[in-house]
Amino acid sequence: PGPPPGPPRVSPDPRAELDSTVLLTRSLLADTRQLAAQLRDKFPADGDHNLDSLPTLAMSAGALGALQLPGVLTRLRADLLSYLRHVQWLRRAGGSSLKTLEPELGTLQARLDRLLRRLQLLMSRLALPQPPPDPPAPPLAPPSSAWGGIRAAHAILGGLHLTLDWAVRGLLLLKTRL
């Protein structure tokens, strides 16, 4: 055994990392809210829109207290991976009417990807179990019409907004347990 290769620099403490993850999640939440408002302005929603392939909302705010750190991070990562896949699909197959949401939709995708990497790094640093994401779901079928793409966009942005809102609350609560 030889000497260590010089004094290592301190990387962010997992608690500080959780802080920056919360900030990133909040920023993504604001982006999503803004993009959803932009979509509503251009294409008003006629009621609620659902998409069967989207994950169900992980948890009600009231039930957050019982959560454990690994469960929150694992579920959040799985749900955000699904939303990332849906945003990629929307950009690829959403049709010309949704091109008006660029470059904001591209920025949203990049930030979502960054948040996912941050969550995985946090789980690694804490040495929490990291179950693999669910096996890839079958490819999403292209929307049947331009209006189908718009309805899908309403559902995706609405669901992502709720998930990120839940994520911020969950992460802040977990910080108190670290």
Epitope: V10, P14, R125, P129
Partner: antibody, heavy 114, light 111 residues
Framework: EVQLLESGGGLVQPGGSLRLSCAAS????????MHWVRQAPGKGLEWVAV????????YYADSVKGRFTISRDNSKNTLYLQMNSLRAEDTAVYYC???????WGQGTLVTVSS | QSVLTQPPSASGTPGQRVTISCSGS?????????VHWYQQLPGTAPKLLIY???ERPSGVPDRFSGSKSGTSASLAISGLRSEDEADYYC???????????FGGGTKLTVL
């Protein structure tokens, strides 16, 4: 400055036991998962065991399962590896590592030989 | 037999750019787990060089860069220097082990 100092290595006969310790300083030990990684002479790195930041999760490489036990004492900023039923193929430099791993100790040599 | 596959050796002349590859399986890189890279200079402990596929810890020169695409990852070293001569290891979380796995290591020689 981050420091991880391993101790407890040495020469032991096959079938014998050793307990390695790793004293941590310069970072919030209780917020990091900790690993033991080993390197046989002239060979590559092999992950041995990991323990979560709070000690609630412990996982082992198949090659040491049932023989080695990882533990930690957050009040003492110390990581341990209890090694039983040692074999010649366990001969290696054992590194204690924190996080990803982000930080590594200088290693302690364990030699299993009769 | 390492779970992640790396070429055993690589070489280049000073100033050149060298790339080291790392491929995995369905329980690690293919499952979307991030890849980390370590440098081990002769006679020393490993040092984290790249984390989360492409991030550099503070103090690591920007000559070192990482990338990941689908089933494999790579480490690129540009403007090669004699002090870069070392062993380089990739690592990723493996869901079947519930721990990290390492590549077999690549010995980089600066000619």
């Amino acid at each position: 400055e981050v420091q991880l100092l391993e101790s407890g290595g040495g020469l032991v006969q096959p079938g014998g036991s050793l307990r390695l310790s790793c004293a941590a300083s310069g970072f919030t030990f209780s917020s990091y998962g900790m690993h033991w990684v080993r390197q046989a002479p002239g060979k590559g790195l092999e992950w041995v065991a990991v323990i979560s930041y709070d000690g609630s999760y412990k996982y082992y490489a198949d090659s040491v399962k049932g023989r080695f036990t990882i533990s930690r004492d957050n009040s003492k900023n110390t990581l341990y590896l209890q090694m039983n039923s040692l074999r010649a193929e366990d001969t290696a430099v054992y590194y204690c590592a924190a996080g990803v791993p982000d930080y590594w100790g200088q290693g302690t040599l364990v030699t299993v030989s009769s | 037999q390492s779970v992640l596959t790396q070429p055993p050796s690589a070489s280049g002349t000073p100033g050149q750019r060298v790339t080291i590859s790392c491929s995995g399986s369905s329980s690690n890189i293919w499952s979307g787990y991030d890849v980390h890279w370590y440098q081990q200079l002769p006679g020393t402990a490993p040092k984290l060089l790249i984390y989360s596929n492409e991030e550099r810890p503070s103090g690591v020169p920007d000559r070192f860069s990482g990338s990941k695409s689908g089933t494999s990852a790579s480490l690129a070293i540009s403007g090669l220097r004699s002090e870069d001569e070392a062993d380089y290891y990739c690592a990723a979380w493996d869901s079947s082990l519930y721990g990290p796995v390492f590549g077999g290591g690549t010995k980089l020689t600066v000619l």
